[in-house]
């Protein structure tokens, strides 16, 4: 969480950003809020990126003002227009690219003053893993698959029964480059699994951490998975 204050103006206004991560090929959000104004005509939102000459996005007098927008962001940005009046300056970024990573500044002018705050935006690929029983294998085997990751993650297996056990000797992980030549498919196989146990496949890089759980009993198989972005926490 980064809070910035304006330097000049009738008085400085508080602008707050939250570091976030974008999943390449998907839409992302750069989060920014500010002390609201009561009239739209006086609100100016400018998004800038370090190292980029043109603007990322500008919104003023109730409209997008894109004449100064940098080419790399053309047609890819939008504010939540209906939320500007209540102090939401967040930017929607379409079709996130690896090159969108960097330091962004959310700069706000209202009738009450000015303010700005920076945010770090990381880009990569992350996806939910799915763990299944591999019935084709000769022994009891689990297969953990996640379709899109970048940069290359680490994969660690864990078990509820054998807590703290190291499964690296009985597992095998491979990374297969996807067709767009950036992201990779992650496949990890765990051998010699026992019944009535819960196994977790944990995939992690510097952007996200995802876990796929599977519980295999005589009568049923239960699955659960979740994904957590690592750099969206307050800082």
């Amino acid at each position: 969480l980064i809070i910035g204050f304006g330097i000049s103006g009738r008085h400085s206004i508080t602008v707050t950003t939250v570091a976030s991560a974008g999943n390449i090929g998907e839409d992302g959000i750069l989060s920014c809020t500010f002390e609201p104004d009561i009239k739209l005509s006086d609100i100016v939102i400018q998004w800038l990126k370090e190292g980029v000459i043109g603007l990322v996005h500008e919104f003023k007098e109730g409209k997008d003002e894109l004449s100064e927008q940098d080419e790399m962001f053309r047609g890819r940005t939008a504010v939540f227009a209906d939320q500007v009046i209540v102090g939401n300056a967040s930017l929607r970024l379409k079709n996130v690219q690896l090159t969108d990573a960097g330091t962004y500044k959310c700069y706000i002018i209202t009738s009450k003053g000015k303010g700005n705050a920076n945010l770090e935006y990381k880009t990569g690929a992350f996806s939910m893993p799915e763990v299944n029983v591999d019935y084709n294998a000769s022994s009891e085997t689990l297969r953990c698959e996640a379709p899109r990751w970048f940069p290359q993650p680490t994969v660690v297996w864990a078990s509820q029964v054998d807590q703290g056990a190291n499964f690296s000797e009985v597992s095998n992980t491979s990374f297969e480059l996807n067709s767009e030549n950036v992201t990779m498919k992650v496949v990890s196989v765990l051998y010699n699994v026992t019944i009535n146990n819960t196994y977790s496949c944990m995939i992690e890089n510097d952007i996200a951490k995802a876990t796929g759980d599977i519980k295999v009993t005589e009568s049923e198989i239960k699955r659960r998975s979740h994904l957590q972005l690592l750099n969206s926490k307050a800082s």
């Epitope: 002390e35 609201p36 009561i38 739209l40 209906d82 009046i85």
Partner: antibody
């Protein structure tokens, strides 16, 4: 849930003053503007003023400068509007309303102020 | 001051009919217009914000459109509970101003 609870009806003589209150709950009081809007009997809506409790910034309709004064007490999440030099044409229902997610998305129940000799 | 002019002042329609209410701003207000419904003895209720965003819990028979100076509130098929007074309001500039209202009454 968001609630705005206003003080009760008032009957005042011409020239007197009245202070109407609006107690907010269910949201972060200091983060959103609170407005006052009035409606004379059988008439439309008229914006009076607004206050941002986070720093006590105010914005007034020029028409009501000198007539209305708004204040906020953050410890009790209450906004007050004082109307001075009352005249019969100030007889109206006075509403407090806030802008949390959208413009004027929550309203108080209204306070009837009657000015009569 | 931005003047908001609503028309018609009164609209006499039957349940099931379509209602079209208009609001004209005296200058460009972008999309900064909200619509409210008010019934006798009650506070106004937000229906549409930012010209076209239907507020939470508002039935989808209500829709808003327009930008610049011309705005429309449409009720696709009137229900008995829709007979009320409707106000438009601009938040583009201060003083914030409301239209004079359109009363939708049963024919």
């Amino acid at each position: 849930q968001v609630q705005l609870v206003q003080s009760g009806a008032e009957v005042k003589k011409p020239g007197a003053s009245v202070k109407v209150s609006c107690k907010a709950s269910g949201y972060t009081f200091t983060s959103y503007w609170m407005h006052w809007v009035r409606q004379a009997p059988g008439q439309g809506l008229e914006w009076i003023a607004a206050i941002y409790p986070g720093n006590s910034d105010t914005d007034y309709n020029q028409k009501f400068k000198g007539k209305a004064k708004i204040t906020a007490v953050t410890s009790t999440s209450t906004v007050y509007m004082e109307l001075s030099s009352l005249r019969s044409e100030d007889t109206a229902v006075y509403y407090c309303t806030t802008t949390v997610a959208h413009y004027f998305d929550y309203w108080g129940q209204g306070t009837m102020v009657t000015v009569s000799s | 001051e931005i003047v908001m002019t609503q028309s018609p002042a009164t609209l006499s329609l039957s349940p099931g009919e379509r209602a079209t209410l208009t609001c004209k701003a005296s200058q460009d207000v972008s999309f900064a217009v909200a619509w409210y419904q008010q019934k006798p003895g009650q506070a106004p209720k937000l229906l549409i914000s930012s010209a076209s965003y239907r507020y939470t819990g508002v039935p989808d028979r209500f829709s808003g459109s327009g930008s610049g100076t011309d705005f429309t509130l449409t009720i696709s098929s009137l229900e008995p509970e829709d007979f009320a007074v409707y106000y438009c309001q601009q938040h583009y500039n201060t003083p914030l101003t409301f239209g004079g209202g359109t009363k939708v009454e049963i024919k």
